[in-house]
């Protein structure tokens, strides 16, 4: 029950996270014009990964896409790539995790297969979350660097002034959405990996024989050896001697024509 809950919660958290990563990637407000200590301006600039926007004081807003690849900063291209990789991995992870859910039965899929799929989706979510966090962090670092560069330019003298990058940019809403979404996807992935441990079969039982003399007749029982996967408490193989009468586990005592020789 706890495993199902962990897996289900991991799936939901990852789903929310990936939806957030998609939203952040599509948002226009990755960087917004810093209005603090700025002269009064009639426009408010903000930019996303795909287009640049302007809101005039009249309320009129206009956006224009980046219709070039070569003219864009390499860092922006890297951020785009990280976010897209994060989305693709997350989407594949979601697809895999749907089939891995314990509450969904698909044909005669074994628990071991579900465990493997859960682990795979968990790893995908973790990498997806890391990609999103990395992308957002790279962009934030770029903003901070540009902010201080433009601050230095802002306070140059009036004479012969040809100022570039005077408008300073600060963190937009998309950065915070991206950080939170990446974190959620990461947490969801970890939860899926934890659920995978519980989904794996507790023990693998091998039919083994325990030979010992019992008076004049020799008896052996199936199930005398018990091996574990390592997930359960029984981590050591136990050899059971019980005078040929019982095995440790009642369930494994099967009457058979070979019981007495």
């Amino acid at each position: 029950m706890a495993v199902t809950a962990c897996q289900g919660l991991g799936f939901v958290v990852s789903l929310i996270g990936i939806a957030g990563i998609i939203a952040a990637t599509c948002m226009d407000q990755w960087s917004t014009q810093d209005l603090y200590n700025n002269p009064v301006t009639a426009v408010f600039n903000y930019q996303g990964l795909w287009r640049s926007c302007v809101r005039e004081s009249s309320g009129f807003t206009e956006c224009r896409g980046y219709f070039t690849l070569l003219g864009l900063p390499a860092m922006l291209q890297a951020v785009r790539a990280l976010m897209i990789v994060g989305i693709v991995l997350g989407a594949i992870g979601l697809l895999v995790s749907i089939f891995a859910l314990k509450c969904i039965r698909i044909g005669s899929m074994e628990d071991s297969a579900k465990a493997n799929m859960t682990l795979t989706s968990g790893i995908m979510f973790i990498v997806s979350g890391l990609c999103a966090i990395a992308g957002v962090s790279v962009f934030a670092n770029m903003l901070v660097t540009n902010f201080w560069m433009s601050t230095a330019n802002m306070y140059t003298g009036m004479g012969g002034m040809v100022q570039t990058v005077q408008t300073r940019y600060t963190f937009g809403a998309a950065l915070f959405v991206g950080w939170v979404a990446g974190g959620l996807t990461l947490i969801g992935g970890v939860m899926m990996c934890i659920a995978c441990r519980g989904l794996a079969p507790e023990e693998t039982n091998y039919k083994a024989v325990s030979y010992h003399a019992s008076g004049h007749s020799v008896a052996y029982k199936p199930g005398g050896f018990k091996a574990s996967t390592g997930f359960g408490s029984n981590t050591k193989n136990k050899k059971i001697y019980d005078g040929g009468a019982r095995t440790e586990d009642e369930v494994q005592s099967y009457p058979s024509k070979h019981d007495y020789v």
Partner: nanobody, 122 residues
């Protein structure tokens, strides 16, 4: 790179008019929004007027509303500021600013002129 040169400033009596021009060279400013700012001695730079790259969206500071008019001629690569009913408090250096409207994934470029002096006497 864009070079901006302001002209049309001078000495004028209160109630008079002046027309300032801001001519751009180096490259066309057809995709740049344009602002006029002014700076009186010992004062902060003050926003005066704005016009977008298409010639619309004109916006003015409250202190100059209904007296100043901003316009542009993209073919001539020039922005104008028509100043009527001038007051002594309008005395300042008037600066032209071209602001890149759609930067490509980086902070927009801002270009500034040297300024032209406007003195209004009473």
């Amino acid at each position: 790179e864009v070079q901006l040169v302001e002209s049309g400033g001078g000495l004028v009596q209160a109630g008079g008019s002046l027309r300032l021009a801001c001519a751009a060279s180096g490259r066309a400013i057809g995709t740049y929004d344009t602002n006029w700012y002014r700076q009186a001695p010992g004062q902060q730079r003050e926003f005066v007027a704005f016009i977008n790259y298409r010639g619309g969206g004109a916006t003015y500071a409250d202190s100059v509303k209904d007296r100043f008019t901003i316009s542009r001629d993209n073919a001539a690569n020039t922005v104008y500021l028509q100043m009527n009913s001038l007051k002594p408090e309008d005395t300042a250096i008037y600066l032209c600013n071209a602001h890149e409207r759609f930067p490509m994934g980086r902070p927009p470029y801002d270009y500034w002129g040297q300024g032209t002096q406007v003195t209004v006497t009473s």
